[in-house]
């Protein structure tokens, strides 16, 4: 496939990737799979630079990030090592809170209205935001 | 490695007590909530006690409320459990696991007898 | 509480053999439930989440399904290295309750 090299319209170019912010909720799941559709992923923050920049774009609003412990670990949905990399988390989080009512924990990871991060139940529907790199391959075929 | 190992089981007379530790290693333990399971001997498994990542929520089986303490100490990787009052039943092998149940010690057996 | 029902309590197959077993729950789960292995002085080990989701690592042979209150553990063709006992979890509300397992045996 061809690289790219410009963003998509209506996506944000920072730092050699390419984002895009909704302003409708959805599930994770469901946010995951919009984000894939567009050859893209969601969010995925590696350092407190690019936090800063998602947070000025998103406000004070409960945003997913590529963040999830659905299977166990915690797992950045493009492979990122959650040990070593950056972490934001509110203070006491994650907790895994059960007293929601939804059954079960929290397994996805969101941006809360100060930006830092919490747990939450995955079927909550809150905005979200894609990422692609640019000079990643893309799916699409090289024109002839 | 990502790993648990629990340590502190032995043999401690009916209404004693007695203290397990779970070192946890390989993984950022702060980040995830903790349990503890038994099995009596030749017995299936039993959740005894649940503690979520910096200690806000805190859950007890009910044949061991009361009488069971969990605890976590983050900035050691370790995870216990102080058992009190201890009786004949309690007799099990404890097991430790963290990362919903993904991740599992090796088991630290309690006996509970005269 | 929720009770977890398992069955059956044990089972006989042969190596190549397609082995189900059954959880049901006292009250709706939705999806939030587990199937563990066990094999004779070990740990648990996990075979399956959120009811059908496999756990990296395990062989596709192993497979979950259902929702609510009827829930299958399915071995599609059982190996030597699969005689053990099987427990459901349900870790949809506290307490985390499991079935009372299966075991499985050499026919």
């Known amino acids: 496939g061809s690289e790219r090299t410009c963003c998509p319209v209506n996506w944000v170019e920072h730092e050699r990737s390419c984002y895009w912010f909704s302003r409708s909720g959805k599930a994770w799941a469901d946010a995951d799979n919009y984000c894939r559709l567009e050859d893209a992923h969601l969010v995925v923050v590696t350092s407190w630079e690019e936090q800063k920049f998602v947070q000025h774009h998103i406000g004070p609003v409960n945003t997913w990030m590529g963040l999830h412990d659905q299977n166990g670990p915690w797992k950045w949905v493009d492979g990122t090592d959650y040990e070593t990399g950056f972490k934001n988390w509110r203070p006491e989080q994650p907790d895994d809170w059960y007293g929601h009512g939804l059954g079960g924990g929290e397994d996805c990871a969101h941006f809360t209205d100060d930006g830092r991060w919490n747990d939450d139940v995955c079927q909550r529907p809150y905005r979200w935001v894609c990422e692609t790199e640019l000079d990643k391959a893309s799916q699409e075929p090289p024109l002839l | 490695e990502v790993q648990l190992v629990e340590s502190g089981g032995g043999l401690v007379k009916p209404g004693g007590s007695l203290r397990l530790s779970c070192a946890a290693s390989g993984f950022t333990f702060s980040s995830y909530s903790m349990i503890w399971v038994r099995q009596a001997p030749g017995k299936g498994l039993e959740w005894v006690s649940s503690?979520?990542?910096?200690?806000?929520?805190?859950y007890y089986a009910d044949s061991v409320k009361g009488r069971f303490t969990i605890s976590r100490d983050n900035a050691k990787n370790s995870l216990y459990l102080q058992m009190n009052s201890l009786r004949a039943e309690d007799t099990a092998v404890y097991y430790c696991a963290g990362m919903t149940t993904v991740i599992w010690g090796q088991g630290t057996l309690v006996t509970v007898s005269s | 509480d929720i009770q977890m029902t398992q069955s059956p309590s044990s089972l006989s197959a042969s190596v190549g053999d397609r082995v189900t077993i059954t959880c049901r729950a006292s009250?709706?789960?939705?999806?939030?439930l587990g199937w563990y292995q066990q094999k004779p002085g070990k740990a648990p080990k996990r075979l399956i989440y959120?009811?059908?989701n496999l756990q990296s690592g395990v062989p596709s042979r192993f497979s979950g399904s259902g929702s609510g209150t009827e829930f299958t553990l399915t071995i599609s063709s059982l190996q030597p290295e699969d005689f053990a006992t099987y427990y459901c979890l349900q870790y949809n509300s506290y307490p985390w309750t499991f079935g009372q397992g299966t075991k499985v045996e050499i026919k």
């Open positions: 503690i979520s990542g910096t200690s806000s929520y805190i």
């Open positions: 009250q709706d789960i939705r999806n939030i």
């Open positions: 959120a009811a059908s």
